[in-house]
Interface confidence: medium
């Protein structure tokens, strides 16, 4: 019996087609992805093949103005239209709190939404009961397939799930649910979840009875043969893991942003054992037409977005200096504003010992593309912010050793004075440079804001300590020459859309007046 698994993950609000780098579509003839194009390909496969499942491994939420405006209603509407069979909860599904998950998505989805390792407690338990499930048994043709879900246990540090959801260890939580499916005589089981490729592989290895793992979170691109676009494969598709009980378990992921549709064909024997698995992600490029019906729907929903982008978010009573001549040479108040917003967006009260789990932000000055003039009645709109942060990136959470951070700050000024983009703006960091010293030895003081303290204060950076830092995904991926971050990071979790983070902060503050306050000094 043959099953076709179509899968997406980390779509992050890319409802419309995008450029090849998943930013805003500029030249339509070369654009990719989007739900209208995805629908065309999915329907083509559904018509051609008998046993098809369309699955999503989480993080539909967060990433473009679509999410900012519609807050998840767009996810439910278009996933319903595409007739998804199941979805696993990702960490970003909690970005607007539990209510922001329940109302727009859980109550509106016409497909099961899954996670076996999230347990509700207190008053939330009855409110959320039945709205998400640990597993679902789906009829596929004349057979039955069990889908069991999982979500990153780091979610409380990455999003806003509140205090009434407990995120258990994935493997510990999955095993009893898989065992339960076995007692129901379900012998074909897919683990669908959002914890990253390393955890996906562990699940394949450790959870007895899981036949296939469909993952997300790490934006992993797997491919067999010559890849069709710019993404470099992290391994073959499917990636085969040998389980502890000797089975070959295929593990897949489909990069991110709806650029690819994962396509995996699995052959099962009559006892539900995987006999063979093969496939590849399908690049959703312009050779695949956009479905006219879905496209018309997108255009209808789009109208509200255009109206939103000119509405006032808040006011500034000072000039927001985002000019190259400031932000690439010295501390600029636009950099301070953005870093403050980044930290504010990551406030998660961990426990009594920590005021927060992260206190530091770094931001490449070259990523700040425009100032905002306060003389326009002080008004700040989404449109204004899109000029400042036009790349559609995310502000991510990483863990780095102090020694890596020191290298990053040396890199920040290694060719100072040439208006290059790597000059770092900061938050929760005090840095002093001596430009008279040779490149690679110019950082003379580097103090960082404590997290394990009741009154935050600045302490010298420790080379062997591990720190959490918020930074643009561009830097996490080694951009602007920050190869040391990419090579040495210990953990990387993708975060919220950059403009959304700043716009939310401005809306919350209502009136802003960021200053230049001595975060970056030259001796």
């Amino acid at each position: 019996w043959e099953l076709t698994i179509l899968h997406t993950n980390d779509v992050h609000s890319r409802l419309e087609q995008t450029s090849e780098d998943s930013s805003k579509c500029v030249n339509a003839s070369r654009c990719m992805g989007g739900v209208a194009r995805l629908f065309t390909k999915v329907q083509q496969i559904r018509r051609a093949e008998p046993n098809v499942l369309l699955l999503d491994a989480g993080d539909q939420y967060q990433g473009t103005i679509w999410f900012t405006v519609y807050k998840g209603a767009e996810v439910a509407h278009f996933m319903n239209a595409l007739r998804y069979d199941a979805m696993a909860l990702g960490n970003h599904e909690f970005d607007n709190g539990v209510e922001g998950l329940i109302e727009p998505l859980l109550k509106e989805a016409k497909f099961p939404i899954l996670s076996a390792n999230i347990k509700a407690k207190g008053p939330l338990a009855s409110q959320i009961s039945g709205l998400y499930l640990p597993y679902k048994v789906l009829p596929v043709g004349d057979e039955v397939v069990g889908i069991v879900g999982y979500t990153s246990k780091e979610t409380p540090f990455l999003s806003n799930p509140g205090t009434n959801l407990v995120f258990e260890d994935e493997i510990t939580a999955l095993q009893p649910e898989v065992d339960k499916l076995k007692t129901l005589n379900v012998n074909k089981i897919i683990a669908l979840g959002h914890s990253g490729f390393e955890t996906d592989k562990l699940i394949a290895q450790k959870v007895r009875g899981v036949d296939v793992v469909v993952g997300g979170h790490s934006n992993t691109f797997l491919y067999t043969g010559n890849p069709p676009s710019k993404e470099v494969p992290a391994g073959k598709y499917p990636f085969i893991v040998t389980s502890d009980d000797g089975r070959k378990v295929p593990v897949v992921q489909a990069y991110a942003f709806g650029k690819y549709l994962g396509y995996l064909k699995i052959e099962f024997d009559e006892r539900g054992n995987v006999i063979s698995s093969h496939g590849n992600p399908i690049l959703l490029n312009s050779s695949i037409p956009e479905d006219p019906s879905i496209k018309a729907d997108i255009n209808k929903w789009r109208i509200k977005l255009d109206n939103y982008s000119t509405q006032e978010l808040g006011k500034t009573i000072v000039y927001l200096d985002g000019s190259s001549q400031s932000c690439r040479f010295r501390e600029c108040n636009m950099g301070n504003l953005i870093c403050d917003a980044m930290i504010n967006n990551n406030l998660r009260h961990a426990d009594e010992m920590f005021w927060n789990h992260v206190s530091m932000c770094i931001l490449n000055g070259g990523g700040i593309r425009s100032p905002i003039d306060e003389r326009n009645n002080g008004t700040i709109t989404w449109e204004n912010l899109a000029a400042v942060l036009p790349f559609g990136g995310t502000f991510d959470l990483v863990q780095l050793k102090g020694s890596t951070l020191k290298k990053a700050f040396e890199h920040s000024v290694h060719r100072y004075g040439q208006s290059t983009g790597e000059f770092l703006q900061v938050g929760g960091i005090h840095v002093v440079y001596d430009l008279s010293r040779k490149p690679g030895d110019r950082v003379v003081k580097l103090d960082v804001l404590c997290t394990k303290c009741r009154v935050p204060s600045y302490d010298p950076l420790k080379m062997d300590e591990i720190y959490k830092v918020i930074l643009p995904n561009f830097l996490a991926n080694g951009g602007d020459g920050f190869q040391m971050i990419k090579d040495e990071l210990l953990r990387h979790d993708s975060g919220d859309q950059d403009i959304n983070v700043v716009s939310t902060y401005i809306s919350k503050m209502k009136v802003i007046y960021p200053a230049v306050e001595g975060r970056i000094k030259f001796s």
């Epitope: 048994v137 789906l138 019906s293």
Partner: antibody, heavy 121, light 107 residues
């Protein structure tokens, strides 16, 4: 309110075709399957097939394959069922029904009033 | 195809009685089962789905149970408006077949 209104009764000769319409109102027509079910006089219910109005994707009961065609006109929120090569045993009341798909839990939650099709020479 | 067998095919009962109708599938339908009520000359009306979930607006005297191949519809205390024909339907693999019906009449 949500409703499905079907076309009126039909009398057809054996070998002919019949086309029954089902007009939806009160909800987004393209978001739900339309199913067709028939019931011969004094008999039980028999599922014919379904169509997804957004893209016209269909699934038929093998028993009716080749004789039944399900179509939609989304601009007027109307579904159609055409049955060809009619025979006397096709005499029945034909119902359209909306299939709710909430979170994968399926059922027919809204039904048309039924259209009586009589096949007689 | 999965066949649905309902029993009894007809049943006489009085107002206030507790009534049970059973539905047996020829294969496991994994709780993908709905119950409908139909009155003469009318379209069927949804009562329960997922074997045991009460549809919106349906009185709580109706309940469903069962799993695998055997399912039950129970009316805890018959009311005059409950005299009708009842059908089960599975939503496992197509074709989605109905049971033959149970006609519930006044004793």
């Amino acid at each position: 309110q949500v409703q499905l209104v079907q076309s009126g009764a039909e009398v057809k000769k054996p070998g002919a075709s019949v086309k029954v319409s089902c007009k939806a109102s009160g909800y987004t027509f393209t978001s739900y399957d339309i199913n067709w079910v028939r019931q011969a006089t004094g008999q039980g219910l028999e599922w014919i097939g379904w169509i997804y109005p957004r893209d016209g994707f269909t699934k038929y009961n093998e028993k009716f394959k080749g004789r039944v065609t399900l179509t939609v006109n989304t601009s007027i929120s109307t579904a159609y069922m055409e049955l060809s090569s009619l025979r006397s045993e096709d005499t029945a009341v034909y119902y359209c029904a909306r299939k709710e798909g909430y979170r994968g839990d399926w059922y027919f939650d809204v039904w048309g009033q039924g259209t009586t099709v009589t096949v007689s020479s | 195809d999965i066949q649905m067998t309902q029993s009894p095919s007809s049943l006489s009962a009085s107002v206030g009685d507790r009534v049970t109708i059973t539905c047996r599938a020829s294969g496991n339908v994994h709780n993908y089962l709905a119950w409908y009520q139909q009155k003469p000359g009318k379209a069927p009306k949804l009562l329960l789905y997922n074997a045991k979930t009460l549809a919106s607006g349906v009185p709580s005297r109706f309940s469903g149970s069962g799993s695998g191949t055997d399912y039950t519809l129970t009316i805890s205390s018959l009311q005059p408006e409950d005299f009708a024909t009842y059908y089960c339907q599975h939503f496992w693999s197509t074709p989605w077949t109905f049971g033959g019906g149970t006609e519930l009449e006044i004793k």
